[in-house]
Structures are given as C-alpha cells and as structure tokens.
Amino acid sequence: EDELQVIQPEKSVSVAAGESATLRCAMTSLIPVGPIMWFRGAGAGRELIYNQKEGHFPRVTTVSELTKRNNLDFSISISNITPADAGTYYCVKFRKGSPDDVEFKSGAGTELSVRAKPS
C-alpha cells in the first residue's frame, strides 16, 4: 500500500453541547508533500474548519504535535460545541502546488451530532 490513504475511522461522533469534539484523521504516508485541511461539508460550499499551513482557528486544537517529525496523526479537537457545529467533517490532504495547493485525497467523513447540554 504505497499510495497515501486517508484514515478517518469514525462514521459518527455525538457530543453534548458545550463539550469538545475529537475528530480523528491520519495519513498512511508523508508523501506527497502538502498541508492537511479540515472542512465541514463537501463541494463548493464547504466550510474551512482548520488549515495546517495557515490561519487562526481559536476553537480548534490538534490532538498530536503536528511539527513532530514523521507525524501522521492529524486529528483535531473542536471546543465548546454548539448545535450549529453539527454536520459532516472531512479531513483532506492537499498536494503542494504553484501557485495553489491541489486537493489530493479526502477522508470518508465523520458526522458530528450535537446532543442537548445535560441539565
């Protein structure tokens, strides 16, 4: 299995409002070179949730240290979940390009559902 595969194991994750949601994703290879991004939804209207390369994403933290050499785990945690966060999240590998990076492979998605906050 030489070609990079995206491992996005959970089909569904359920989180109570106010809690954090962990979305798991890993790659089977470091090649090709290029960033990982997380999106909510698919297609043209998808929403960028996290970009490994650039940007400020105050509610998102990486589960593993992404600067660590040979790291293949690109799981993220999203804090203070609200019902508006519900949707399907995709972990996407991009290939470094010029001028723009090119989408290379996507995970199969993880559906995030939000439960009411326990009283």
Partner: antibody, heavy 123, light 113 residues
Framework: QVQLVQSGAEVKKPGSSVKVSCKAS????????ISWVRQAPGQGLEWMGS????????NYAQKFQGRVTITADESTSTAYMELSSLRSEDTAVYYC????????????????WGQGTTVTVSS | DIVMTQSPDSLAVSLGERATINCKSS????????????LAWYQQKPGQPPKLLIY???TRESGVPDRFSGSGSGTDFTLTISSLQAEDVAVYYC?????????FGGGTKVEIK
C-alpha cells in the same frame, strides 16, 4: 496475504490477568484496526475493543472498560489484549481480527482473523 | 449501544432449499454521506474463527459463493442462502459497523433438515 497469529492457550486463576498477543504478517499494520472479539463456550461473539496503531489509543466496549487494555507495537506488528481481574465468566476463546478498510478510511468488517486463544479461568 | 437482534435462533433447511436469516438493529446503520449500510455478516463453523461473508449489507467478500446474498437498509437486514449446501452448516452472525461498540447479533444456527 495478511495473516494473524495468536499466542497459545492460557490457564489462569481468578483475580489474575492474562495478556494475549496477535502478530500480523504479510501486510501493512499501522493503518488498519485490530479488533478483539471473545466467545464463551457455546455462546455468541462479543466485541471487546480495537486499536488503530497509527493513532495509538484504543477504543473499548463499556462492559470491559477499566479491565481490558489493548496495545500495539508497530515495530513488531503485534497487537496485545490484556484482561485483568479475571473471573470464571471470562473463560472463552479470544480472537484478534483485522478490520477491512475502505477508501477514505472507514472500516466495514473483520476480514482477517487469528486462530483464537483459549483462556480458561479456574481455581 | 446499538442492539442487534437476529431471528430465528436456529433454522433447519433441506439441501438445495433457500435459507433466510433476519437481523434488526436498534438504530439505523446507514451512513448518509455515502449511502452505505455498515452491516456485516459472518459464518462460523465449529472450532474455527468467523469468516466475513458480506459487508455494506450486500457486498460479497472476495471468494464467497454467489449463493450467499445480503439485502436491507437502515435497520432491517437479511442474509439469504439461495440453495443450501452441506458445507453451509454453521452459525451466522450479523454485526453493525456504524458505531462503536461494534455489536453482534446473537447468531443463527443453520442445519440440514
């Protein structure tokens, strides 16, 4: 072709622990899930938990939480299942199995199984 | 946890006849993003580990004879052996692969009448 070879039969005393190994050969190890399933004599199949070595952390059935530990050693392509505080009801055949993975990283079923390890708990 | 209920517990069928096993899940195992049902069927013969027969509710694993077929969606599934052979005597299990823990049905024993 991937093969899973498990460690041999064990006889244990109540209250003790058992650690069963599962060595994979013939394929990639780190990006596949390894699940553990047990089967008590004359009973059905019971999923205990699984690990995807690339993530390192395991996922357990609530029933076994706190009593089972699943680990993986990527350097030897070996998964381990340790069950503690053994009781007679833990007498069973314990299987490891590799979870088949589709494009995009979802798992769909256990496509390769170990031969099973019989654990007998008796005083 | 998703509860998987299989019926019947046992089934005796004449050689060459059809065998039908049902499996019901307590909640849907259909993943809407790819329209796949994460439901697997296994065959287990005495003294052997289980063998994967069908995944995604209806996709036969490589090498599985075409007399085995799976159908259903959402919460209701069926495994059919179209023409029972002597080597099909075994216990059959369904398992949902949608949400952890990946629970099994209780099993259906298929025998020859």
């Amino acid at each position: 072709q991937v093969q899973l070879v498990q460690s041999g039969a064990e006889v244990k005393k109540p209250g003790s622990s058992v650690k069963v190994s599962c060595k994979a050969s013939g394929g990639t190890f780190s990006s596949y899930a390894i699940s553990w399933v047990r089967q008590a004599p004359g009973q059905g199949l019971e999923w205990m938990g699984s690990i995807i070595p690339i993530f390192g952390t395991a996922n357990y059935a609530q029933k076994f939480q706190g009593r089972v530990t699943i680990t993986a050693d990527e350097s030897t392509s070996t998964a381990y299942m340790e069950l503690s505080s053994l009781r007679s009801e833990d007498t069973a055949v314990y299987y490891c199995a590799r979870d088949g993975r589709e494009y995009g990283g979802h798992y769909y079923g256990m496509d390769v199984w170990g031969q099973g390890t019989t654990v007998t708990v008796s005083s | 946890d998703i509860v998987m209920t299989q019926s019947p517990d046992s089934l005796a069928v004449s050689l060459g006849e059809r065998a039908t096993i049902n499996c019901k899940s307590s909640q849907s195992v259909l993943y809407s993003s790819n329209n796949k049902n994460y439901l697997a069927w296994y065959q287990q013969k005495p003294g052997q580990p289980p063998k994967l027969l069908i995944y995604w509710a209806s996709t036969r694993e490589s090498g599985v004879p075409d007399r085995f077929s799976g159908s259903g969606s959402g919460t209701d599934f069926t495994l059919t052996i179209s023409s029972l052979q002597a080597e099909d005597v075994a216990v059959y299990y369904c398992q949902q692969y949608y949400l952890s823990p990946f629970t099994f049905g209780g099993g259906t024993k298929v025998e020859i009448k």
